[in-house]
């Protein structure tokens, strides 16, 4: 068995680090899937929702074959940082409707922060540049209405779910190339 959770890993084997990142990503994916289902149950979604400030999906079935580790990790970190900002915004701006999901949203934020720390560690171990590529940060304005914040929540959780789903596939594929 590996070291206890939370203890520093002595080994700097990138494959073991990737395994750890995949495990955290899978765990966050399960949380996101569960919360998205809870959202649909509490606040039925009328069709697909989008949010201009969310990152566009970085990976697709066509791009999986050409993935390179530095690019994937950098882009994944940038996208997840954007999702973290959106989850923080939801928790603050969502109003009473979304406060009913507060324990779960808080846990999701904590897991997302943990995964970002793990990715940062992995990138430093692989001597990859930490700086995120220059990208304009779109300020997140107030939701137009409570209904609007619910639509935004559907979009954020749906987008995060897709991003994490591709992240797991991409990281697993990259592990085989190490």
């Amino acid at each position: 068995p590996g070291p206890p959770a939370g203890s520093p890993r002595v080994s700097s084997d990138p494959r073991a680090d990737l395994d750890s990142a995949v495990l955290l990503t899978r765990s966050l994916l399960a949380d996101t899937r569960q919360l998205a289902a809870q959202m649909r149950d509490k606040f039925p979604a009328d069709g697909d929702h989008s949010l201009d400030s969310l990152p566009t999906l970085a990976m697709s079935a066509g791009t999986l074959g050409s993935l390179q580790l530095p690019g994937v990790l950098t882009r994944l970190r940038v996208d997840l940082m954007s999702y973290l900002r959106h989850v923080q915004w939801l928790r603050r701006a969502g109003g009473p409707s979304l406060k009913t999901l507060e324990p779960e949203l808080g846990a999701l934020q904590a897991r997302l922060e943990r995964l970002l720390r793990r990715l940062q560690l992995l990138m430093s171990r692989l001597a990859l540049p930490q700086a995120a590529p220059d990208q304009p940060v779109i300020p997140l304005g107030p939701p137009a209405s409570a209904w609007g914040s619910i639509r935004a929540a559907h979009a954020i959780l749906g987008g995060l779910h897709l991003t994490l789903d591709w992240a797991v596939r991409g990281l697993l594929l990259l592990k085989t190339r190490l």
Partner: antibody
Framework: QVQLVESGGGVVQPGRSLRLSCAAS????????MHWVRQAPGKGLEWVAV????????FYADSVKGRFTISRDNSKNTLYLQMNSLRAEDTAVYYC??????????WGQGTLVTVSS | QSVLTQPPSASGTPGQRVTISCSGS????????VNWYQQLPGTAPKLLIY???LRPSGVPDRFSGSKSGTSASLAISGLRSEDEADYYC???????????FGGGTKLTVL
Amino acid sequence: QVQLVESGGGVVQPGRSLRLSCAASGFTFSHYDMHWVRQAPGKGLEWVAVISYEGSNKFYADSVKGRFTISRDNSKNTLYLQMNSLRAEDTAVYYCARTPGSHFDYWGQGTLVTVSS
Amino acid sequence: QSVLTQPPSASGTPGQRVTISCSGSSSNIGSNYVNWYQQLPGTAPKLLIYYDNLRPSGVPDRFSGSKSGTSASLAISGLRSEDEADYYCAAWDDSLSGVVFGGGTKLTVL
């Protein structure tokens, strides 16, 4: 333009009940969470209750929990506050307020409730 | 006693800059947006600042909001006689599951 008009206030004896209404117009009522806020004579603002846009989630201040009930009828664009077991300390101007998220962007003019024997 | 703490009164002369403080905790100001409301004598409150530091359309840029940790403040520059009113800070409180207000600050323009 957005309008919120409260009604139903008046003089009532301690222990009795009263129902306040807030008629909304000028916006899509069913898209907004709605609050009741009160202000005792010469005192500050006190939050009373909130109901989510579709009516399923409600939160109350400890001071009114178990006595007051917030509700809404989206087909009538109306918000309600059912006040039971009224006490002297419930005497106040009651305002309804609209919220797009974390702030009250529009307020009604208020309706005065006086609880006195 | 209010959950958010404001000075009961503040004053200034026309043209001056006045600041009103609002102190809270990690469960309200520390983790949620702060809003400020102005209540002119005999009228309903009006939104003045939301999202910590944003102004609704129609509110002069003489009014500004800021936040640091568990405290917030409202600044009014170029004070005018029509600014004489009660000012309230407010925020959602995660522990109480509700909105909390400051006790209000009565601003007098001397």
